[in-house]
């Protein structure tokens, strides 16, 4: 088949914690990213306060964070715990534009969700969220 | 409705699955008023790292 997957919905939004990072200029100063779940799709990084620039795509790595605390989630020695979270938003309607990070609907919803999570997990330790995916309920 | 799936990252040892879910559920009312998002059917689980190729995107709830 022709075509190549691009424009991943994999985005890391962060709360400004001082994680050391391996990033590229396209990362817009985002301190770290999680590799995309698309094996053939670049990772897209974006600050929660700005619109996603779908052209800023690249691969980057999880930083070597250090911590002596016992892990609360299965992981390697990255110093980071990851949690998968799923929920329904019952007062919104899915449409196909939620499959594309360059659309207004996707960006507005991602921004609201990102800001919401920054509010919820204000305590130190929250590094960010990534791999946002929307699907019909 | 819209189902949202995402991955949260925390510093190692700062939070567990139960607390992630509890804090999120406690915020649902404020989410409705502040962001006009009516949230339900919350599910939280650990993500092994590195992520598997299958990942969470194949889940259907």
């Amino acid at each position: 088949a022709s075509g190549s997957a691009s424009g991943s919905a994999s985005t890391l939004v962060h709360n400004g914690t001082s994680a050391r990072a391996t990033t590229t200029p396209a990362s817009k100063s985002t301190p770290f990213s999680i590799p995309s779940h698309h094996s053939d799709t670049p990772t897209t990084l974006a600050s929660h306060s700005t619109k996603t620039d779908a052209s800023s795509t690249h691969h980057s790595s999880v930083p070597p964070l250090t911590s002596s605390n016992h892990s609360t989630s299965p992981q390697l020695s990255t110093g980071v715990s990851f949690f998968f979270l799923s929920f329904h938003i019952s007062n919104l309607q899915f449409n196909s534009s939620l499959e594309d990070p360059s659309t207004d609907y996707y960006q507005e919803l991602q921004r609201d969700i990102s800001e919401m999570f920054l509010q919820i997990y204000k305590q130190g330790g929250f590094l960010g969220l990534s791999n946002i995916k929307f699907r019909p309920g | 409705s819209v189902v949202v799936q995402l991955t949260l990252a925390f510093r190692e040892g700062t939070i567990n699955v139960h607390d992630v879910e509890t804090q999120f559920n406690q915020y649902k009312t404020e989410a409705a008023s502040r962001y006009n998002l009516t949230i339900s059917d919350v599910s939280v689980s650990d993500v092994p790292f590195p992520f598997s190729a299958q990942s969470h995107h194949h889940h259907h709830h």
Partner: antibody
Framework: EVQLQQSGAELVRPGSSVKMSCKTS????????INWVKQRPGQGLEWIGY????????EYNEKFKGKATLTSDTTSSTAYMQLSSLTSEDSAIYFC??????????WGQGTLVTVSA | DIQLTQSPSSLSASLGERVSLTCRAS??????LNWLQQEPDGTIKRLIY???SLDSGVPKRFSGSRSGSDYSLTISSLESEDFVDYYC?????????FGGGTKLEIK
């Protein structure tokens, strides 16, 4: 490598129906959308509609409502499009295009439908 | 519906030449525009997504840009396999619509 395999060419009678398929392989995600597009011989492209695989969520171009019906089967990672009450205007190549982090990322090779008495 | 006016409808050019194809949108579509390439056998491949992002595996001689409501696909130095058909596609709002196409022919 992602592949979209569409079903073979169809020669059908006016007034009848035809159902074509679009099978995805080589991709780990089973949740994504499929768009369907029409191209008449020597002409441009027209969007027919969209279905999110494994759900009953669909969107249609008003022009094709009542003409096209989109369905899918998650277990076989296959999307289907049925065209009804066929006329010569429906003679065309029909493409499926799937999402992969963004819309219209991968395209099938097309299914030629010829409506002829 | 959003109209995409694609120009020129056909273009004759020489190997190595730089060419630009244009799509004008009738309404604001932001960056929600793709460029597609169609081979003579019908095969369609996406070249550019979100106005200016190059799909993986697409040669760097292809680039996309925007100026207001005008969207351009530029091929910096034509190669023999580039002489095919090109379409723009907007996905800002349903129904998604395509430009009329540009046939690129060898001079």
């Amino acid at each position: 490598e992602v592949q979209l395999q569409q079903s073979g060419a169809e020669l059908v009678r006016p007034g009848s129906s035809v159902k074509m398929s679009c099978k995805t392989s080589g991709y780990t995600f089973t949740s994504y959308g499929i768009n369907w597009v029409k191209q008449r011989p020597g002409q441009g492209l027209e969007w027919i509609g969209y279905i999110y695989l494994g759900s009953d969520y669909t969107e249609y171009n008003e022009k094709f409502k009542g003409k096209a019906t989109l369905t899918s089967d998650t277990t076989s990672s296959t999307a289907y499009m049925q065209l009804s009450s066929l006329t010569s205007e429906d003679s065309a190549i029909y493409f499926c295009a799937r999402s992969a982090g963004s819309l219209f990322a991968y395209w099938g090779q097309g299914t030629l439908v010829t409506v002829s008495a | 519906d959003i109209q995409l006016t694609q120009s020129p409808s056909s273009l004759s050019a020489s190997l190595g030449e730089r060419v630009s194809l244009t799509c004008r949108a009738s309404q604001d579509i932001g960056i929600t525009l793709n460029w597609l390439q169609q081979e003579p056998d019908g095969t369609i491949k996406r070249l550019i997504y979100a106005t200016s992002s190059l799909d993986s595996g697409v040669p760097k001689r292809f680039s996309g840009s925007r100026s207001g409501s005008d969207y351009s696909l530029t091929i910096s130095s034509l190669e023999s396999e580039d002489f095919v058909d090109y379409y723009c596609l907007q996905y800002a709002s349903s129904p998604y619509t395509f430009g009329g196409g540009t046939k690129l022919e060898i001079k």
